[in-house]
Interface confidence: medium
């Protein structure tokens, strides 16, 4: 009987050690997660969405009609912003209509206020034409309001209610866009 009790005690102690180790690992993971919050969130969301597959947009993304939007919490240059979106299976925001522009600017007002956000618009270095990332031209009402005085390559960004232009190498927040998952019900 005593042997049985001591065996159980040893097993409990072993279990406790394993739990402490797991907690330590989790704390370590959480610490590194804080450094790369965006990517950890995306990872966790992917795990969750593959398990449930019910939400049209990943966690921390905003839905409007058929699109999901992610408003970054980090700054980067235009090119790196595009790469960051790419990692999430998305592209920099492509604004198709005034309605979409109004939704975006309204959402930004609620979330963060008047900051600069890169969108997927850049000026062709040769022709000077503005192009979205998919190669299409923006509609006339959605052209950047002011031409940047920069001699460098120029890219588009959203600030308050306006679409503006700036040197692509400046640091700004950015907005990613992807299709919302269609319900399989």
């Amino acid at each position: 009987k005593l042997l049985q009790v001591s065996t159980i005690a040893m097993q409990q102690q072993e279990k406790l050690i394993q739990q402490e180790r797991a907690l330590l690992n989790f704390t370590e993971w959480k610490r590194s997660c804080a450094l790369q919050m965006k990517y950890c969130q995306a990872f966790m969301q992917n795990s969750l969405s593959s398990a449930h597959n019910s939400s049209p947009c990943p966690n921390n993304w905003i839905q409007n009609r058929e699109s999901c939007y992610y408003v970054s919490e980090i700054w980067s240059i235009w090119h790196t912003s595009q790469e960051n979106c790419l990692k999430e299976g998305s592209t920099l925001l492509q604004i198709e209509s005034k309605e979409e522009m109004d939704f975006i600017t309204g959402s930004l007002r609620k979330i963060k206020g008047s900051y600069d956000y890169w969108v997927g618009l850049s000026q062709d270095g040769h022709s000077g034409r503005w192009l979205w990332q998919d190669g299409s031209s923006p509609s006339p009402g959605l052209l950047p309001a002011e031409r940047s005085q920069s001699a460098n390559q120029v890219c588009g960004y959203v600030k308050s209610n306006s679409l503006l232009s700036s040197n692509c190498s400046t640091w700004k927040y950015f907005i990613c866009e992807k299709y919302a998952l269609r319900s399989s019900v």
Epitope: I77, H79, E83, L86, K87, G125, L131, Q133, D134
Partner: nanobody, 116 residues
Framework: QVQLQESGGGLVQPGGSLRLSCAAS????????MAWYRQAPGGQRELVGG???????GYADSVKGRFTVSRDNAKNTVYLQMNRLKPEDTAVYYC??????????WGQGTQVTVSS
């Protein structure tokens, strides 16, 4: 001037596989993110997937688990491996890139038709 050339398209049966290639010239290939897009007749060009300069990949939800993007920096080529193809994957497939300066470049596209 950056040039992109896609190849590998064709007619394939549902459930089949294809591997598309995109060869790049005139660019410091390894520092660029490369993306695959597709455009179905009458539709908009949409992102399929992409690979960043550090090798991270991302995919549209519609192709996740079926398509894989990879790159060979030595050959200046990016690939799109497409498995378990469906009729709705029928489209012209384009590769595209943006340079750090913000310039965007496109290939001419390669037709993929999934039909029995």
């Amino acid at each position: 001037q950056v040039q992109l050339q896609e190849s590998g398209g064709g007619l394939v049966q549902p459930g089949g596989s294809l591997r598309l290639s995109c060869a790049a010239s005139g660019t410091s290939f390894s520092i660029n993110g490369m993306a695959w897009y597709r455009q179905a007749p009458g539709g908009q060009r949409e992102l399929v997937g992409g690979i960043t300069s550090d090798g991270s990949t991302g995919y549209a939800d519609s192709v996740k688990g079926r398509f894989t993007v990879s790159r060979d920096n030595a050959k200046n080529t990016v690939y799109l491996q497409m498995n378990r193809l469906k009729p709705e994957d029928t489209a012209v497939y384009y590769c595209g890139t943006s340079t750090p300066r913000g310039d965007s470049y496109w290939g001419q596209g390669t037709q993929v038709t999934v039909s029995s």
